[in-house]
C-alpha cells in the first residue's frame, strides 16, 4: 500500500435545499484505471461512511441506486455532490481515494470538508 | 503567512450603507470560508454572520437578515460585507476572520461610527 | 438561539495561579462545537480552543478546554502575566451561532 496526497477544501455551507458539493483532487502517481471513492463522516469522534463507488477512467461514477451522494470525474478530480442534508448532518466530510488497479495499490486520505447544513426557518404561520 | 487586511475606518449617517472589505492572502481563498463579527465600543462579541467562499453560500444572523449582505470576489481573494439602513447602535469594530471551526485568523478590524 | 452564559464576569487572580472561567449554553451544543477566544483591548480576537477540547495553532499547553452538552470549562493551570484578558466562549453547532458575554481574568 503506498500513500497518495489528496486534496479538499476546508469549509463548505450546503445550500438552503441541504445539498453540498465540492471537489476531491487526488495526485495520481501512475495511470490508475480502476479507482475507489469513499466519503467518510466524522462528528463526536465517530466515523461512519456515506457513501462510496468505483469507477473506470473517463466513466461516470456509480453509487448505489439509494445512495445521498452522486459525483462525476475528470482527471484526478472527483466532483462530489451530497444530497438530503439536515443541520444534524453537520460534520467532517473525509475523501478516501484508492488507486484499485493497476498495481501497486495507492491509498489517499484527505483531511476532511466541514460541511455546515443549515435547516430553514419555518415560515410563520399565516392567514387566508 | 496567512493575512486578512480590512479596508478603513468610515463615518456614516443614519439610514446609510458601509461596504467594509477584507483581503485575504496566504492561504486558498476558496477553501475556506469567512465570517464576520462586531464589537460594540466596551462590548462584548456579536456574531453577524458567515460566507462559503468555495460556493458563496451564506448564513446570517437573523437580528441582522435583510439588512446585510455578505459576498465574495475569488479572483481578488476578497470578501465583502455590506449593512444597510444604518442605525446608531451599528456603531461598533467589524472584524473578519478566516472560519472553519471558529476564527483562526482575523482582518484587524474597521471601525464604523454611525452619527447624525 | 442557544444562549451562552459566562461565569463569572469578573475573576480576580495572580499570576502562576489556575484560572477556571465556565461556559453555560441554554441548549446542548451539538458534536461539542464550542471555540474559546482571548482578546486584550484594542486587539482582534485570538482563537484559543476549538471543538471543546482541540488548541489552536501555536496555544500554549496551558491552555486546555473540556465539557459537553450544556457545560463547558477554559481552564489555564498557571496564569502568565500575558494571560490577563478577556475571554470568550462561541458555539458553532446551531445556527446562529452566537457567543457568551465575556469573563474578564484580572490581576489581583
Known amino acids: 500500500c503506498k500513500a497518495m496526497h489528496v486534496a479538499q477544501p476546508a469549509v463548505v455551507l450546503a445550500s438552503s435545499r441541504g445539498i453540498a458539493s465540492f471537489v476531491c483532487e487526488y495526485a495520481s502517481p501512475g495511470k490508475a484505471t480502476e479507482v475507489r471513492v469513499t466519503v467518510l463522516r466524522q462528528a463526536d469522534s465517530q466515523v461512519t461512511e456515506v457513501c462510496a463507488a468505483t469507477y473506470m477512467m473517463g466513466n461516470e461514477l456509480t453509487f448505489l441506486d439509494d445512495s445521498i451522494c452522486t459525483g462525476t470525474s475528470s482527471g484526478n478530480q472527483v466532483n462530489l455532490t451530497i444530497q438530503g442534508l439536515r443541520a444534524m448532518d453537520t460534520g467532517l466530510y473525509i475523501c478516501k481515494v484508492e488507486l484499485m488497479y493497476p498495481p501497486p495499490y495507492y491509498l489517499g486520505i484527505g483531511n476532511g470538508t466541514q460541511i455546515y447544513v443549515i435547516d430553514p426557518e419555518p415560515c410563520p404561520d399565516s392567514d387566508f | 503567512q496567512v493575512q486578512l487586511v480590512q479596508s478603513g475606518a468610515e463615518v456614516k449617517k443614519p439610514g446609510a450603507s458601509v461596504k467594509v472589505s477584507c483581503k485575504a492572502s496566504?492561504?486558498?481563498?476558496?477553501?475556506?470560508?469567512i465570517s464576520w463579527v462586531r464589537q460594540a465600543p466596551g462590548q462584548g462579541l456579536e456574531w453577524m454572520g458567515w460566507?462559503?467562499?468555495?460556493?458563496?453560500?451564506?448564513n446570517y444572523a437573523q437580528k441582522l437578515q435583510g439588512r446585510v449582505t455578505m459576498t465574495t470576489d475569488t479572483s481578488t481573494s476578497t470578501a465583502y460585507m455590506e449593512l444597510r439602513s444604518l442605525r446608531s447602535d451599528d456603531t461598533a469594530v467589524y472584524y473578519c476572520?478566516?472560519?472553519?471551526?471558529?476564527?483562526?485568523?482575523w482582518g484587524q478590524g474597521t471601525l464604523v461610527t454611525v452619527s447624525s | 438561539e442557544i444562549v451562552l452564559t459566562q461565569s463569572p464576569a469578573t475573576l480576580s487572580l495572580s499570576p502562576g495561579e489556575r484560572a477556571t472561567l465556565s461556559c453555560g449554553a441554554s441548549q446542548s451544543v451539538s458534536s461539542s462545537y464550542l471555540a474559546w477566544y482571548q482578546q486584550k483591548p484594542g486587539l482582534a480576537p485570538r482563537l484559543l480552543i476549538y471543538d471543546t477540547s482541540s488548541r489552536a495553532t501555536g496555544i500554549p499547553d496551558r491552555f486546555s478546554g473540556s465539557g459537553s452538552g450544556t457545560d463547558f470549562t477554559l481552564t489555564i493551570t498557571r496564569l502568565e502575566p500575558e494571560d490577563f484578558a478577556v475571554y470568550y466562549c462561541?458555539?458553532?453547532?446551531?445556527?446562529?451561532?452566537?457567543f457568551g458575554q465575556g469573563t474578564k481574568v484580572e490581576i489581583k
Open positions: 496566504g492561504y486558498t481563498f476558496t477553501s475556506y470560508g
Open positions: 462561541q458555539q458553532y453547532g446551531r445556527s446562529p451561532w452566537t
Open positions: 460566507i462559503s467562499a468555495y460556493n458563496g453560500n451564506t
Open positions: 476572520g478566516r472560519w472553519v471551526r471558529g476564527v483562526e485568523y
